[in-house]
Amino acid sequence: CVFCRLPAHDLSGRLARLCSQMEARQKECGASPDFSAFALDEVSMNKVTEKTHRVLRVMEIKEAVSSLPSYWSWLRKTKLPEYTREALCPPACRGSTTLYNCSTCKGTEVSCWPRKRCFPGS
């Protein structure tokens, strides 16, 4: 997801540069996060890209990538599921919507989630 939008931020290039500098200290840094299980709408894609840009900027300034694995984990476990739910549930989703795969960046028309899945227990 984080590499699909806002190309001016050059996240993939910056991440590669950061990791090459920190390689000796941070072996897992360069491992590209696997977000293939997720798909987001345009707005959420931009949000997650902007957040990652800001996180990387602080890591660049501090020249420290130790918190990167925990950031990827937070995206995978918390933020991406939250954004997916927002994109596929009311009020954002009505009938169907276009989601972009976080790995391929390709857009697909998908049906909104049923109300029960969006609001369990309602």
Epitope: Q21, E50, K51, R54, V55, V58, E60, I61, K62, E63, A64
Partner: antibody
Framework: EVKLQQSGGGLVKPGGSLKLSCAAS????????MSWVRQTPEKRLEWVAT????????YYTDSVKGRFTISRDNAKNTLYLQMSSLRSEDTAMYYC??????????????WGAGTTVTVSS | DIVMTQSPASLAVSLGQRATISCKAS??????????MNWYQQKPGQPPKLLIY???NLESGIPARFSGSGSGTDFTLNIHPVEEEDAATYYC?????????FGGGTKLEIK
């Protein structure tokens, strides 16, 4: 005591060069990004440049890009600003400042006493 | 660039009273629940000194009579009760977007 000791200011002709220095003490210099901020004669503050903790990343305000170079020597605990092609609008008090973060919010938490740069023919 | 506008340009406050300084940004300086707004104090012949970061967090060693509030585009620095030593110029600064920019300053005089 956390301290930033500045030197290197002075009077220079338009088109000339000057190098400012900022010696740090009382904290682990290599752990912090550092910046230069200037204050015009009208007392307006303007961020000039920032360098990352290890010196790998540098950032400049548009008006000084290609003319000023920020650098650091972590072995000497010293920050530098090499200024060239100086213009009258570069006349200001130049401060070195420690660049810090609270969460992701950046700020300048330690400042040097400043050094005056006057560009005039 | 984000333009920071402070008001008033100067004010005079009686000892022990409240001083209120406003800062307005040309666009929001909030992101993801945080306000990227800082306040500094500068006395004549001295460098600026950090008072408050992230809109409302008091820097270590700064007296509790200083407080910051606000979000989005509108922020306020309050000093209460004002003391003699608070006579200075106060600057707001945003760090939400490059380049980081400062307000024009507010000069506080103690009556």
């Amino acid at each position: 005591e956390v301290k930033l000791q500045q030197s290197g200011g002075g009077l220079v002709k338009p088109g000339g060069s000057l190098k400012l220095s900022c010696a740090a003490s009382g904290f682990t210099f290599s752990s912090y990004a550092m910046s230069w901020v200037r204050q015009t004669p009208e007392k307006r503050l303007e961020w000039v440049a920032t360098i990352s903790s290890g010196g790998s990343y540098t950032y400049y305000t548009d008006s000084v890009k290609g003319r000023f170079t920020i650098s650091r020597d972590n072995a000497k605990n010293t920050l530098y600003l090499q200024m060239s092609s100086l213009r009258s609008e570069d006349t200001a008090m130049y401060y070195c400042a420690r660049h810090n973060y609270g969460n992701y919010v950046g700020y300048f938490d330690v400042w040097g006493a400043g050094t005056t740069v006057t560009v005039s023919s | 660039d984000i333009v920071m506008t402070q008001s008033p340009a100067s004010l005079a406050v009686s000892l022990g009273q409240r001083a209120t300084i406003s800062c307005k940004a040309s666009q929001s300086v909030d992101y993801d629940g945080d306000s990227y707004m800082n306040w500094y104090q500068q006395k004549p012949g001295q460098p600026p000194k950090l008072l408050i970061y992230a809109a409302s967090n008091l820097e270590s060693g700064i007296p509790a009579r200083f407080s910051g509030s606000g979000s989005g585009t509108d922020f306020t620095l309050n000093i209460h009760p004002v003391e003699e030593e608070d006579a200075a110029t106060y600057y707001c600064q945003q760090s939400n977007e490059d380049p980081w920019t400062f307000g024009g300053g507010t000069k506080l005089e103690i009556k």
